[in-house]
């Protein structure tokens, strides 16, 4: 009997410590997409509609922040769409990329720790396009550091919460 | 202000050319794109191409591909429209217009045409 | 090619009237649709742009609905500054026009 309470114990003791293990998966904001043709920072996501939802971790000023040291695996998703209805390009020739950078509020820095993209030639007499960009990664990341993203050309982001949207958790401590 | 003043009236025989002139002002010229329509007599308004003032890229109707170039001089804020070998049927008032699309914003031409010109009477006649 | 078709073609109304213009796109449009105002001798006038915007400087008697395929222009009370030919339009493709005079 003293074993089976023992045994119940340890996956309680389990379980609560896999609750406890932080995470995120963070939606676009599709009604305050910013404008602009360069590198802009996204800071507009969702943390607690549709698929997004948010533990252990913070949301605030558009950046994810770390609240616990650890490994973590850090996700990407950006989707990039154009569709004749709205108009034309302006250039054919585009660079679509984004960037996932890592800033430390204590050491003041900021290091790019993902990008990913392409230059692509986006005709004008196609009437659809659609160009979708993954990256992610495993990194140490200490309590109250901030990751945030950038892309190139958010005119083009598709809105969707299946399309664009980023993450992260905690996969071990550090020993 | 903003302001789009186009170039006066011209009478040309048909198969010649015509060169008309929008000068723009009250805005930064590179930043924007410009659309050229017409309206033939009893017609419907006609798109017929835009520049992106700040590139020189261009588009143009199918109708008038091979017969129109669009330019522009950003030292004097001024696109220009020639449609050549013209025919009687060019006959039409021709408006050049801006697309409300900030280009540093973003880089879609969004064909919402918020300043026009007065317009330039074309008139082909034998 | 997207083919634009207005109703009616003209209209007659009193001053303080509602007039309502229809627009209808020839497939889904979603709301890139705007109107224009052309007068005579003068530089056409944006008045309406995605659909329901008013664009700066318009009277607020000017409205826009719609959405998909079928959109409409609506002045709550026609005024003899009014008279005029109400064009719709998407990106490449204009209607064909409707003119509204006093009666």
């Known amino acids: 009997e003293k074993a089976m309470v023992d045994g119940s114990w340890l996956d309680l003791a389990k379980r609560s410590k896999l609750e406890a293990q932080p995470f995120a998966h963070l939606t676009i904001n599709a009604t305050d997409i910013p404008s602009g043709s360069h590198k802009v920072s996204l800071s507009s996501w969702y943390h607690d509609r549709g698929w997004a939802k948010i533990s252990n971790m913070t949301f605030s000023n558009g950046k994810l922040i770390v609240n616990q040291d650890g490994f973590y695996y850090l996700y990407a998703n950006i989707c990039f769409r154009h569709h004749e209805t709205s108009g034309d390009l302006a250039t054919e020739y585009l660079q679509l990329m984004v960037y996932v950078t890592k800033t430390s509020i204590k050491i003041p820095s900021s290091h790019t720790l993902m990008k990913g993209g392409s230059t692509k030639y986006w005709s004008g007499n196609s009437e659809f396009h659609f160009y979708s960009i993954n990256v992610g990664g495993f990194f140490k990341l200490r309590s109250g550091e901030e990751i945030s993203i950038e892309v190139s050309n958010p005119s083009l982001l598709d809105p969707d919460q299946d399309a664009t949207y980023f993450g992260a958790f905690k996969v071990r401590d550090i020993d | 202000q903003v302001q789009l003043v186009q170039s006066g009236a011209e009478v040309r025989k048909p198969g010649a050319s015509v060169k008309v002139s929008c000068k723009a002002s009250?805005?930064?010229?590179?930043?924007?794109?410009i659309h050229w329509v017409r309206q033939a007599p009893g017609q419907r308004l006609e798109w017929m191409g835009w520049?992106?003032?700040?590139?020189?890229?261009?588009k143009f109707s199918q109708k008038f591909q091979g017969r129109i170039t669009v330019t522009r001089d950003t030292a004097a804020s001024t696109a220009y429209m020639e449609l050549r070998s013209l025919r009687s049927e060019d006959t039409a008032v021709y408006y050049c217009?801006?697309?409300?699309?900030?280009?540093?914003?973003?880089?879609?031409?969004?064909?919402?045409?918020?300043?026009w010109g007065q317009g330039t009477l074309v008139t082909v006649s034998s | 090619e997207i083919v634009m078709t207005q109703s009616p073609s003209s209209l007659s109304a009193s001053v303080g009237d509602r007039v309502t213009i229809t627009c209808r796109a020839s497939?889904?449009?979603?709301?890139?649709l705007n109107w224009y105002q052309l007068k005579p001798g003068k530089a056409p006038r944006l008045l309406i742009y995605?659909?329901?915007s008013l664009q700066s400087g318009v009277p607020s008697r000017f409205s826009g609905s719609g959405s998909g395929a079928e959109f409409t222009l609506t002045i709550s009370s026609l005024q003899p500054e009014d008279i005029a030919t109400y064009y719709c339009q998407h990106t490449r493709a204009f209607g064909q026009g409707t003119k509204v005079e006093i009666k």
């Open positions: 520049i992106n003032a700040g590139n020189g890229n261009t």
């Open positions: 217009a801006r697309d409300i699309s900030n280009m540093v914003r973003g880089i879609i031409i969004a064909y919402y045409f918020d300043y």
């Open positions: 009250g805005y930064d010229f590179s930043n924007y794109a």
């Open positions: 995605g659909a329901s």
């Open positions: 497939q889904s449009i979603s709301r890139y």
